[in-house]
Interface confidence: low
């Protein structure tokens, strides 16, 4: 069962990271949570411009998911549908962040209490997505780009997105094996 | 990185059947399905066939009786046979995968099979 | 079997002008999910396809602005606004909505 997310370092409201949101319950392929300029919502195979999102945290639990290449808030209407909006709707655009034990999260429109998922792709119907609520693996991406002196790799934030956020287990082992590489 | 290398003979016989192995790295064949697409000599590009990440396939119905698409996960590896060749079936073959919205973003080298005596 | 009628077969053009390439669908090719799955591909001589354009109107990561796909129904269109030397070689309009899958015949982009 999906636990809320308890890390500590999420209690401080301004919390961001930059994250790609995979997922291996879309029907056809395993995707990233994609963002586009004309605020759809769709799926990129693999890590694109518009699938790197930045995730910042609005209260314990609640995060608002933006993307960084178009400006739009992730946004969920009242029937499920994902739309990408330049504006932030609190109502619409807030998500809760719950945590499963795999290292994969649950998103929920805060206010509707609808999961988030991917929206369907060309799947033969033999093809079934499965059932339930849509898991995201949060994928590093590039911090926000600061100046660096040559040679030094700036650190990696911790991920707060995990029950381990300062790396101290191992490698996580919830990544996909598409991934693995 | 995604790759997908094809090995399989360049020559085959009339009336012999044609077997091509598509390897892939850089993902997982749970993941992705792969397309087997043929282009003719100085012609077009005409799509064979499909295998899902589940494992089942489609066929194009003109090629139905003659072609199999099998996996092995565990390899990544993708078999492509096709029996009763004709000299009308020499091209070059390509495997490729699908993306999320569209369907051939990675493609193989291509194989150049020439059907002769 | 959905047939996928490009035109013109050859489209001679200078550089830096504009482009257009039609392909006509034997029957509409909405999925039954909704959507339309046209794809638009360039092949140079001894490469493989490249995707540029899917499902009609959205740019491949990568693919300049210069390439815009459009249409519905059984109509669609893509565009080039300034063709550069790049962009020489075969385009292939290609459906995905239907079982089996079709391109269409290729249209041959090259300077006038």
């Known amino acids: 069962h999906p636990i809320p997310d308890s890390s500590p370092l999420l209690q401080f409201g301004g919390q961001v990271r930059q994250r790609y949101l995979y997922t291996d319950d879309a029907q056809q392929t395993e995707a990233h949570l994609e963002i586009r300029e004309d605020g759809t919502v769709g799926g990129a195979a693999d890590q694109s411009p518009e699938s790197l999102l930045q995730l910042k945290a609005l209260k314990p639990g609640v995060i608002q998911i933006l993307g960084v290449k178009t400006s739009r808030f992730l946004c969920q209407r009242p029937d499920g549908a994902l739309y990408g909006s330049l504006h932030f709707d609190p109502e619409a655009c807030s998500f809760r962040e719950l945590l499963l034990e795999d290292g994969y999260n649950v998103y929920q429109s805060e206010a509707h209490g609808l999961p988030l998922h991917l929206p369907g792709n060309k799947s033969p119907h033999r093809d079934p997505a499965p059932r339930g609520p849509a898991r995201f693996l949060p994928l590093p991406g590039l911090p926000p780009a600061l100046p660096e002196p040559p040679g030094i790799l700036a650190p990696q934030p911790p991920d707060v997105g995990s029950s381990d956020p300062l790396s101290m287990v191992g490698p996580s082992q919830g990544r996909s094996p598409s991934y693995a590489s | 990185q995604v790759q997908l290398i094809q090995s399989g003979p360049g020559l085959v016989q009339p009336s012999q059947s044609l077997s091509i192995t598509c390897t892939v790295s850089?993902?997982?064949?749970?993941?992705?399905?792969i397309h087997w697409v043929r282009q003719s000599p100085g012609k077009g590009l005409e799509w064979l066939g499909m295998?899902?990440?589940?494992?089942?396939?489609d066929y194009n119905a003109a090629f139905m009786s003659r072609l199999s698409i099998t996996k092995d996960n565990s390899k990544s590896q993708v078999f492509f046979k096709m029996n009763s060749l004709q000299a009308d079936d020499t091209a070059i073959y390509y495997c490729?995968?699908?993306?999320?919205?569209?369907?051939?973003?990675?493609w193989g080298q291509g194989t150049l099979v020439t059907v002769s005596a | 079997d959905v047939l996928m009628t490009q035109t013109p077969l050859s489209l001679p053009v200078s550089l830096g002008d504009q482009a257009s390439i039609s392909c006509r669908s034997s029957?509409?090719?909405?999925?039954?999910?909704?959507?339309?799955?046209l794809e638009w591909y360039l092949q140079k001589p001894g490469q493989s396809p490249k995707l540029l354009i899917y499902k009609i109107s959205n740019r491949f990561s990568g693919v300049p602005d210069r390439f815009s796909g459009s249409g519905s129904g059984t109509d669609f269109t893509l565009k080039i606004s300034r063709v550069e030397a790049e962009d020489l070689g075969v385009y292939y309009c290609f459906q995905g909505s239907h079982v089996p899958y079709t391109f269409g015949g290729g249209t041959k982009l090259e300077i006038k």
């Open positions: 850089g993902f997982s064949l749970t993941g992705y399905a």
């Open positions: 295998i899902w990440k589940s494992g089942n396939t």
């Open positions: 029957q509409i090719i909405v999925h039954n999910n909704g959507d339309t799955y």
């Open positions: 490729a995968r699908n993306g999320y919205d569209y369907e051939f973003v990675y």
